[in-house]
Interface confidence: low
Amino acid sequence: MLRWFLSHLLGVWLLLSQLPREIPATDDKKLKACGRDYVRLQIEVCGSIWWGRKAGQLRERRQISEPLAEVVPSSIINDPEILSLMLQSIPGMPQELRIATRSGKEKLLRELHFVLEDSNLNLEEMKKTFLNTQFEAEDKSLSKLDKHPRKKRDNYIKMSDKCCNVGCTRRELASRC
């Protein structure tokens, strides 16, 4: 049991070690983002951390080193044909980011982009639903919601509320990736 725990701890540490050493000053700027915009911002921030490139050709400047695949369990990589990492089963990863990994690093994916909106997104709805390209990617998606630890879900929800109501920084979002 201890060995199992320590190996997981090591895995988490290795994953965390992929995060950027430096975060640009702009990451401390408060941004307000609700619903679809919140998810876009989260993907923009997290996308650059996972892939070490500009997410959707937006403004991220973070770099990561390559050996991320080494610390991701092989069971996660469920399609060897595709170059991008299949991060499907990492808890807490936004649905959009999971979808996003399917199309390869080269495109950084259409699913990541937000072209439609739901103007009637109230706070309650936002707790269970986030929207992207008019694609609807629920907060871990309703069908998968119960598979995630309650605390993690609550934290995710609280962060979305915070970003929407009072604003949040990229640094804060990065800490959730």
Epitope: C34, G35, D37, Q95, I99, R102, S103, R110, E111, H113, F114, V115, L116, E117, S119, K128, T129, N132, T133, Q134, F135, E136, A137, E138, S141, L142, S143
Partner: antibody, heavy 115, light 112 residues
Framework: EVKLEESGGGLVQPGGSMKLSCAAS????????MDWVRRSPEKGLEWIAE??????????YYAESVKGRFTISRDDSKSSVYLQMNSLRTEDSGIYYC??????WGQGTLVTVSA | DAVMTQNPLSLPVSLGDQASISCRSS???????????LNWYLQKPGQSPQLLIY???NRFSGVPDRISGGGSGTDFTLKISRVEAEDLGVYFC?????????FGSGTKLEIK
């Protein structure tokens, strides 16, 4: 790779019916809002109908020109969306595109309504 | 309904030129959340439309930075700073702020 493939187009007489299908792959279909858009020489691109996800109770929206005649539906288990078209008119002719959230578009299927 | 008026209908250019396409809406596309849902697409012959710009100015993944979008409220512009052969085709705007979603009539970008 994301794919949307329409089928079911063809030639139909005015007043007739036709059902279009769109098979999707490469993304989580059940979470997607799906739309039908058509292109005709007379009207250009024209939005026809939208069906939202189960989380949005599969709510549907229609263009005024097709309301009461066309029905959009989906089968999440088959990753497919459909457009049932009744009481077809000549002005319904065109290329019908299936689109996932206006980000993905299929290649389209040609519908010709003519006597 | 929001009527989308796009100009010009045809835009002859030389490679390397700048091209500018205008899209005007009959009503404001800005939503109460402050966002404006106006997208630009390119359709090449025999292909389905491809998304270039979403929410007025956000460049879609893989779209070169020669292509940019701007504007607000009812007036929007797509600019191509240095036209290349791959840019040729029909450009159109679409508003997805209000149901029914409506399209511009399209602008054909062609070689002079």
């Amino acid at each position: 790779e994301v794919k949307l493939e329409e089928s079911g187009g063809g030639l139909v007489q005015p007043g007739g019916s036709m059902k279009l299908s769109c098979a999707a792959s490469g993304f989580t279909f059940s979470d997607a809002w799906m739309d039908w858009v058509r292109r005709s020489p007379e009207k250009g691109l024209e939005w026809i109908a939208e069906i939202r996800s189960k989380a949005k109770n599969h709510i549907t929206y229609y263009a005024e020109s097709v309301k009461g005649r066309f029905t959009i539906s989906r089968d999440d288990s088959k990753s497919s969306v459909y457009l049932q078209m009744n009481s077809l008119r000549t002005e319904d002719s065109g290329i019908y595109y299936c689109t996932g959230g206006f980000a993905y578009w299929g290649q389209g299927t040609l519908v010709t309504v003519s006597a | 309904d929001a009527v989308m008026t796009q100009n010009p209908l045809s835009l002859p250019v030389s490679l390397g030129d700048q091209a500018s396409i205008s899209c005007r809406s009959s009503q404001s596309l800005e939503k109460s959340n402050g966002n404006t849902y106006l997208n630009w697409y390119l359709q090449k012959p025999g292909q389905s439309p491809q998304l270039l710009i979403y929410r007025v100015s956000n460049r879609f993944s893989g779209v070169p930075d020669r292509i940019s979008g701007g504007g607000s409220g009812t007036d929007f512009t797509l600019k191509i700073s240095r036209v290349e052969a791959e840019d040729l085709g029909v450009y159109f705007c679409v508003q997805v702020s209000h149901v029914p979603f409506t399209f511009g009539s399209g602008t054909k970008l062609e070689i002079k």
